[in-house]
Amino acid sequence: APTSSSTKKTQLQLEHLLLDLQMILNGINNYKNPKLTRMLTFKFYMPKKATELRHLQCLEEELKPLEEVLNLAQSKSFHLRDTKDLISNINVIVLELKGSETTLMCEYADETATIVEFLNRWITFCQSIISTLT
C-alpha cells in the first residue's frame, strides 16, 4: 500500500507535470504565436484509455513528436522555454510516475488529434489523478 509520503511525492510530480503541460499549451495556443497554423497540422496519437499512472507510457511515446512541434514554434516574436530541457524534465517525471516495473504496450485511439487536443487530454488526466490522491 502506498505510504502518505509516496502519495505526496506522486502528487507533487503530477502537479509539476500538469504545470509543464499547461505552460506549453498556453505558450502555443495563443494569437501571439505566428507558427500556430503549422503546428496544428501535426498529428498526435491519443490513448484509448488513460486512467492510471501506467498509462503515461502513451504520453512518453509522444514526447519526441511534441519536441519537434515545439522546436517549430521558436521564432523572434515567440519563444518557449528551452524545448530540450522542458521535454527532458517531462520525460523524467513521466518515467518516475509510470514506474519501470511493468512495460505497458500503449493502446491508441483510432482518431488522431491536434497538439491542443493532445495537451488538453493529458492535462485532464493529471487533474483527474491528483483529485483522487487528495
Epitope: P34, T41, K43, T114
Partner: antibody, heavy 124, light 108 residues
C-alpha cells in the same frame, strides 16, 4: 460574411514585378488569429500556396518562390498585397487571396474564405 | 520539395462510391485536408484533419488516413459532386505547405 476581392493588372511583362491587392470586407485583417494567404492556380493545373501574412505582420512563403515574393498588409485600408519579382511565363496563373480561419479552440486552420480569383498573364 | 500524389482522374456512376487517394511521406504525422473545386469557382473545404467534416458538408463525404495514404470517400456520389478534389498538407517539418496535383471526379 467575410468577402475578399483581388485587384491588379491582368497583364505583366516578363522580368517585371507582379503586384496584386486583396481588399477584405466584413472582417479586419488586424483581428487576432487569422492568416491572410495568396494561392495561385496555373491554367488547367493544380493549386499552389504562395505565402501568408499573419495579423501581427509575420510572413511566411513557399520556399519554391526563392524569395521572389513579398506579402504586406495595410490595416488602414484593410488590404493585403502580393509583389512577385522577376516574373516569367511560368507565373501566369489565376491568383486567389484567401483567409485561413480556425475550427474553434481545439481544431486546426483551413482556408475558409476565398476571393473569386484574378487571371494574371505574363507576356511581352 | 515535398509532394502529395493524387490520381489525375476518377470516374463513377451516380450512387456509386468514389475514392480518391493522396499519398505523401509525411502523412503518418501530418493531417490531410480535402478541398473541392467546381469549374470556375474557388475551392471549398470538404474534409479537415483527415476525417472531420465541416458543418454544411453532406454526410456522404468522409475521410480517412493510414500510413502515408489519405483517402477521400464519397459514398453514393451525385452528379453535383463532379469537381476537382485537392488534398492539402505539409512536409514533416511543416515548412512546405502543399496541395496535391488534384483529381478530376467524373460522375457519369
Amino acid at each position: 460574411q467575410v468577402q475578399l476581392q483581388e485587384s491588379g493588372p491582368g497583364l505583366v511583362k516578363p522580368s517585371q514585378t507582379l503586384s496584386l491587392t486583396c481588399t477584405v470586407s466584413g472582417g479586419s485583417i488586424s483581428s487576432g488569429g487569422y492568416y491572410w494567404s495568396w494561392i495561385r492556380q496555373h491554367p488547367g493545373k493544380g493549386l499552389e500556396w504562395i505565402g501568408y501574412i499573419y495579423y501581427s505582420g509575420s510572413t511566411d512563403y513557399n520556399p519554391s518562390l526563392k524569395s521572389r515574393g513579398i506579402i504586406s498588409g495595410d490595416t488602414s485600408k484593410n488590404q493585403f498585397s502580393l509583389k512577385l519579382n522577376s516574373v516569367t511565363a511560368a507565373d501566369t496563373a489565376v491568383y486567389y487571396c484567401a483567409r485561413e480561419g480556425r475550427f474553434g479552440e481545439l481544431g486546426s486552420y483551413y482556408f475558409d474564405y476565398w476571393g473569386q480569383g484574378t487571371l494574371v498573364t505574363v507576356s511581352s | 520539395s515535398y509532394e502529395l500524389t493524387q490520381p489525375p482522374s476518377v470516374s463513377v456512376s451516380p450512387g456509386q462510391t468514389a475514392r480518391i487517394a493522396c499519398s505523401g511521406d509525411a502523412l503518418p504525422r501530418k493531417f490531410a485536408y480535402w478541398y473541392q473545386q467546381k469549374s470556375g469557382q474557388a475551392p471549398v473545404l470538404v474534409i479537415s484533419e483527415d476525417s472531420r467534416r465541416p458543418s454544411g458538408i453532406p454526410e456522404r463525404f468522409s475521410g480517412s488516413s493510414s500510413g502515408t495514404m489519405a483517402t477521400l470517400t464519397i459514398s453514393g456520389a451525385q452528379v453535383e459532386d463532379e469537381a476537382d478534389y485537392y488534398c492539402f498538407s505539409t512536409d514533416s517539418s511543416a515548412n512546405h505547405r502543399v496541395f496535391g496535383g488534384g483529381t478530376k471526379l467524373t460522375v457519369l
